[in-house]
Amino acid sequence: SGVFQLQLQEFINERGVLASGRPCEPGCRTFFRVCLKHFQAVVSPGPCTFGTVSTPVLGTNSFAVRDDSSGGGRNPLQLPFNFTWPGTFSLIIEAWHAPGDDLRPEALPPDALISKIAIQGSLAVGQNWLLDEQTSTLTRLRYSYRVICSDNYYGDNCSRLCKKRNDHFGHYVCQPDGNLSCLPGWTGEYCQQPICLSGCHEQNGYCSKPAECLCRPGWQGRLCNECIPHNGCRHGTCSTPWQCTCDEGWGGLFCDQDLNYCTHHSPCKNGATCSNSGQRSYTCTCRPGYTGVDCELELSECDSNPCRNGGSCKDQEDGYHCLCPPGYYGLHCEHSTLSCADSPCFNGGSCRERNQGANYACECPPNFTGSNCEKKVDRCTSNPCANGGQCLNRGPSRMCRCRPGFTGTYCELHVSDCARNPCAHGGTCHDLENGLMCTCPAGFSGRRCEVRTSIDACASSPCFNRATCYTDLSTDTFVCNCPYGFVGSRCEFPVGLPPSFPW
């Protein structure tokens, strides 16, 4: 679609005569008829296939024609067309004399024609005017012409329609050749696709307007480049959404099980060495002189009653010292200077001489012991504490301090490792002699059933159109992360289909 424009500039008819040679009375009141048609090698009469236009009376005999385009007038003359400009044309311009005010062909005398010119040729679409002058024996016509495209039409033949827009269907202006030029912030064939915030992750982010960055499920951050870990993940991170990869020292599905109790809690006292031995479990190795589960108890070296023959024990910083009764000597008062004549046996013990009276031996009644029957029987000597329990004399009684995992008066009872429900996700716990064992339900594994081994919901490739599939660990279902231009739970719907789509 376009317009053929004809600008009449000057008409000369000095003698004021008609084509027949007859003079006009009182002068030639001149108007023009224009016929535009398809190219003809020899321009002949017939339909004006591209259009016609007539002017009012523009002057008498010789006159210049004012450019009237700015004032909404009729110069240049407009010949609009609604087809692809073919690049060639034929043009007929007739100058007529109007004796009266009626310019209709049928109202004019047959010899009212002043002059007639016919031209033909090639004409490309463009802004530049082509200047021409045609002379006959009596007249001269100077004019210029051009072809320009109508509003919203572009290209060499005015065949390309382009209407600038800034709405849901596109955001663009039109280039001189009719191609689209996207407005800032938009891209794509029809400039419908917003340019997201610079750096917005190509797969994990998207936008509905320019400079925006909206995150797809499982992603977060200004540029949607940070994954969201599994809900409830305590001491872990992710590299893809819904993961929970545990930090060092933590375990379990949610990384909430402490595997490094020693570092996190420092339970061992008095310079003891701590060793991790499982979830929330540890062992303290005490320095000499300390005992207890956490090495919190100071050990007295006199507790083992090292002094013999009634010697009394004194604790010292670097050990102990025995104070021997009369007649005894040695580190533990183990050497005697007595004989049976000195009645050395206490608590009803009977004395037997040895080595021709050089020394003796006491035979003690029940409940007494020692080389002189001076000691009550130490209830710990028979090592009554089972399972590695530590025996402690407490006056007339004794007690057993049990190792972790044992209880009872003599540490004879095995504490059930299953009592604290160590098996995750409904695993069944079995007590064993040296620990426990978990039998895991389907979908879980690991020493404590803490590892999820459920089926991969993405294995069946449920997502279409190059979408990324993620498994939601909490529901064992898939989540499809759609690329731009596709929607639906499986990214199965394109938001637009090209006009050439084979319906």
Epitope: R490, E492, F493
Partner: nanobody, 120 residues
Framework: EVQLVESGGGLVQAGGSLRLSCAAS????????MGWYRHQAPGKQRELVA????????HYADSVKGRFTISRDNAKNTMYLQMNSLKPEDTAVYYC?????????????WGQGTQVTVSS
């Protein structure tokens, strides 16, 4: 092979309402993903108006959000598009589309289309 038949199109004044229906053949209708596309002019792309996936999740084009509602009745093997507050720019041929799924593929089926004309 799935057959789709649309109905409910017609001429309506701006601000008025229409309800489009799409009846589908096939015994596994509830597992189909279904959508409405529209074609507004020759040479323009066919544009997704609304879609409902087999899991029931819905999606709408920005231009119709809040005005159009997509739904399905699995017992009647029919999908609907309730169109309220219609505008002249909603004038188009509306096509019903369904997708039937295999293990990792789907087949596309289209109806013949129903004309909706909104006059101002």
């Amino acid at each position: 092979e799935v057959q789709l038949v649309e109905s409910g199109g017609g001429l309506v004044q701006a601000g008025g309402s229409l309800r489009l229906s799409c009846a589908a053949s096939g015994s596994t209708f509830s597992s189909y993903a279904m959508g409405w596309y529209r074609h507004q002019a020759p040479g323009k792309q066919r544009e997704l108006v609304a879609a409902i996936s087999s899991d029931g999740s819905t999606h709408y084009a920005d231009s119709v959000k809040g005005r159009f509602t997509i739904s399905r009745d699995n017992a009647k093997n029919t999908m609907y598009l309730q169109m309220n507050s219609l505008k002249p720019e909603d004038t188009a041929v509306y096509y019903c589309n369904t997708k039937t799924f295999g293990s990792n593929w789907y087949d596309d089926y289209w109806g013949q289309g129903t004309q909706v004309t909104v006059s101002s």
